[in-house]
Amino acid sequence: LEASEEVELEPCLAPSLEQQEQELTVALGQPVRLCCGRAERGGHWYKEGSRLAPAGRVRGWRGRLEIASFLPEDAGRYLCLARGSMIVLQNLTLITGDSLTSSNDDEDPKSHRDPSNRHSYPQQAPYWTHPQRMEKKLHAVPAGNTVKFRCPAAGNPTPTIRWLKDGQAFHGENRIGGIRLRHQHWSLVMESVVPSDRGTYTCLVENAVGSIRYNYLLDVLERSPHRPILQAGLPANTTAVVGSDVELLCKVYSDAQPHIQWLKHIVINGSSFGADGFPYVQVLKTADINSSEVEVLYLRNVSAEDAGEYTCLAGNSIGLSYQSAWLTVLPEEDPTWTAAAPEARYTD
């Protein structure tokens, strides 16, 4: 088996529908071409549940799975599904084997599928297989985001990867939520990052021949505190007919725990405003953001008295925000008439 020889299944003929799960060991750097179904009606190839695109280094195209040069991250489970159905035509796992340098011409051409078949091969210190994926060194992300660091590498023997944080072995045991180490993907994933995750993350890739390392710098930015933000245009001016139901909506965004009130502007002694200059209001609904449907004000079976100005008031430890809308209630007998309502407003 030459190092350049392709790993290839049977030609692209009509497949047996009784495909058994197969395991193929592929040498690093070796091209791969696997077929599934007839070329014109070939199945779709998936890797780990994701459909392969028809272009790229690893591609699924006209029933073929083609890998230009097999890399460690190409290892994994591949499925070929018949077009327009979920029938599995191929179910196989590709395993990274040692790269080959020499062999006998009369060797069994399928011998590479047997992991126990050993070959002499040159030892090679670890090297980065996708340095372009590692160019971003400085990472500044908002608290709560997910961070993924990757150090795709290869070598002979296949290297191992370890992660350090600020120079110390890192397993995530002291981290709330832990970490995900995906050795097959040479990756470290941290979800919901917090300020204590700041620091230097080093991937250390080693084999018997040598080692390489790469540093990622992570900064976690705390969200700047602000008063609640209300979605523009909500609540919206609404026109309803007497006897109908109305919903007013208010969308609130706040990092700090917000408190929401629905207010109706009222008139007292012929005046809308008190001596202090503030409007007279009636509190209709009050709750925290996590209360059920607090952001919606329901008005059932509205009457003419329900017409007027309604305000969504949201506050947190930093400040208050509010936006208002007008409800116009029309008599039942004249539903075509509409009143011009003032614009909803947002005040600092």
């Epitope: 980065w128 340095p131 590692m134 160019e135 971003k136 060194k137 400085l138 990472h139 500044a140 600020d166 120079g167 300020p195 700041r198 620091g199 230097t200 080093t202 390489i212 390392r213 790469y214 540093n215 710098l217 992570l218 900064d219 976690v220 930015l221 705390e222």
Partner: antibody
Framework: EVQLLESGGGLVQPGGSLRLSCAAS????????MSWVRQAPGKGLEWVSL????????YYADSVQGRFTISRDNSKNTLYLQMNSLRAEDTAVYYC????????????WGQGTLVTVSS | QSVLTQPPSASGTPGQRVTISCSGS????????VNWYQQLPGTAPKLLIY???QRPSGVPDRFSGSKSGTSASLAISGLRSEDEADYYC?????????????FGGGTKLTVL
């Protein structure tokens, strides 16, 4: 206008201290890593120190480790370099520089401030 | 002694092509991208080439960069008198001590 403006340089005796400042304007200072780079008279560039946008992580060249402290005040858009136990070999023009997001190269430099350590 | 090695000087006549080399190791150039800075006499350095071969806006296409293995180079074609300056290569270094930025010693370019 996007710019960095250093200040605080001057003449100081060996063993003395000095604090350099770098005022940033025209960009979101708090989300950028920032560095100090120095250049001794007639010599090449030497990276001195780096600080993350939050100020939570700092990094130093071996030559200044334990003597210099980098810090920042994001509310004032200002970067600092506190230099203690100064030596004659610290004499240089000190530049403050912005590390571009992600890749970390220096895409914006200040005009520099001269620090002279001499008795 | 700089971590990255550059020739101390280079020269050329107007219109000529000049190349400046920068040599490093697996922990810096071998693992990271290379950036080049131009420092005109009496001024602060300026970014010239980033990520091995990218030019910031405003930098003429006469300047180009490349990287191979643990070495990089800066090429200047159609040399002009205003190109007379010091040129520095730089890269991150993933040393045992943590991340550092390392520079070359600089190359003084003279336009004859």
């Amino acid at each position: 206008e996007v710019q960095l403006l250093e200040s605080g340089g001057g003449l100081v005796q060996p063993g003395g201290s000095l604090r350099l400042s770098c005022a940033a304007s025209g960009f979101t200072f708090s989300s950028n890593y920032m560095s100090w780079v120095r250049q001794a008279p007639g010599k090449g560039l030497e990276w001195v120190s780096l600080i993350s946008g939050s100020g939570g992580s700092t990094y130093y060249a071996d030559s200044v480790q334990g003597r210099f402290t980098i810090s920042r005040d994001n509310s004032k858009n200002t970067l600092y370099l506190q230099m203690n136990s100064l030596r004659a070999e610290d004499t240089a023009v000190y530049y403050c520089a912005r590390n571009t997001a992600g890749f970390g190269y220096f895409d914006l430099w200040g005009q520099g401030t001269l620090v002279t350590v001499s008795s | 002694q700089s971590v990255l090695t550059q020739p101390p000087s280079a020269s050329g006549t107007p219109g000529q092509r000049v190349t400046i080399s920068c040599s490093g190791s697996s922990s810096n150039i071998g693992s990271n991208t290379v950036n080049w800075y131009q420092q005109l006499p009496g001024t602060a350095p300026k970014l010239l080439i980033y990520r091995n071969n990218q030019r910031p806006s405003g930098v003429p296409d006469r300047f180009s960069g490349s990287k191979s293995g643990t070495s990089a180079s800066l090429a200047i074609s159609g040399l002009r008198s205003e190109d007379e300056a010091d040129y520095y290569c730089a890269a991150w270094d993933d040393s045992l001590n943590g991340p550092l930025v390392v520079f070359g010693g600089g190359t003084k370019l003279t336009v004859l």
